[in-house]
């Protein structure tokens, strides 16, 4: 299933990850999935 | 299953110091943030201090009620985090947890081990 | 430092119904996207546990009927319909800015 609104997939950590995340660690793979 | 476990607690004297241990298992520790929280019935749940990641360069924050007191400290080849507790007060004493998150929030907490500073 | 004030102190709920506690920071901990605003729970003699991170998103595991709203300085964590398990002390914890900082807690009856 796709990730909920304001969320992004994660490959390197298997799983939808919160695009609020991207503030603290915006590096992460999952941060390039949120607007 | 995810784990931490703490060790180092215990009874010292006003002045004294202590050095905190946490294990971590069942998750990436090196990708994770590590912090310190305490809790006391008189100032309840307190954030102490926070390691980053070897890409952040091991950042360091801390409370500014430990600021230049205590130290904290990770050794990612034993997923293990520290807390180095210098000229210990009274007003320290309270159970400390260590807990990790994979950003600025506690995913995971242990099950903590109590400080008491009293002579 | 942010100083984040939670009401009330203490309530009791009857089984099944609803409990609603408030969290009230001293500056707003949100953008136009996002609220850096998260919720634990502590049981007797247990550590605290995520339940809502960035204000609604429910961690994994955490049941439905744990919600999380709110926005700017004010948040509000409701438990519907309360269960016996969910007797326990309530807290909030914002990620604004260092140092981060919780609320005093709500401890939740259930009768």
């Known amino acids: 299933a796709p990730c909920s609104r304001g969320s992004s997939w994660s490959a390197d950590l298997d799983k939808c990850m919160d695009c609020a995340s991207c503030r603290a660690r915006p590096h992460s793979d999952f941060c390039l999935g949120c607007a | 299953e995810v784990k931490l476990e703490e060790s180092g607690g215990g009874l010292v004297q006003p002045g004294g110091s202590m050095k905190l241990s946490c294990v971590a298992s069942?998750?990436?520790?090196?990708?994770?943030?590590m912090s310190w929280v305490r809790q006391s019935p008189e100032k309840g749940l307190e954030w102490l201090a926070e390691i980053r990641l070897k890409s952040d360069n091991y950042a360091t924050h801390y409370a500014e009620s430990v600021k230049g007191k205590f130290t904290i400290s990770r050794d990612d080849s034993k997923s293990r985090l520290y807390l180095q507790m210098n000229n210990l007060r009274a007003e320290n004493t309270g159970i400390y947890y260590c807990?990790?998150?994979?950003?600025?929030?506690?995913?995971?907490w242990g099950q903590g081990t109590t400080l008491t500073v009293s002579s | 430092d942010i100083v984040l004030t939670q009401s009330p102190a203490s309530l009791t709920v009857s089984l099944g119904q609803r409990a609603t506690i408030s969290c009230r920071a001293s500056q707003s901990v949100s953008t136009s996207s996002y609220s850096y605003m998260q919720w634990y729970q502590q049981r007797p003699g247990q550590p605290p546990k995520l339940l809502i991170k960035?204000?609604?998103n429910l961690d994994s595991g955490v049941p439905a009927r744990f919600s999380g709203s709110g926005s700017g300085t004010d948040f509000t964590l409701n438990i519907h319909p309360v269960e016996e398990e969910d007797a326990a002390t309530y807290y909030c914890q914002h990620s604004w800015e260092i140092p981060y900082t919780f609320g005093g807690g709500t401890k939740l009856e259930i009768k």
């Open positions: 960035y204000a609604t």
């Open positions: 069942g998750f990436t520790f090196n990708n994770y943030w």
């Open positions: 807990t990790g998150g994979f950003a600025d929030y506690f995913d995971y």
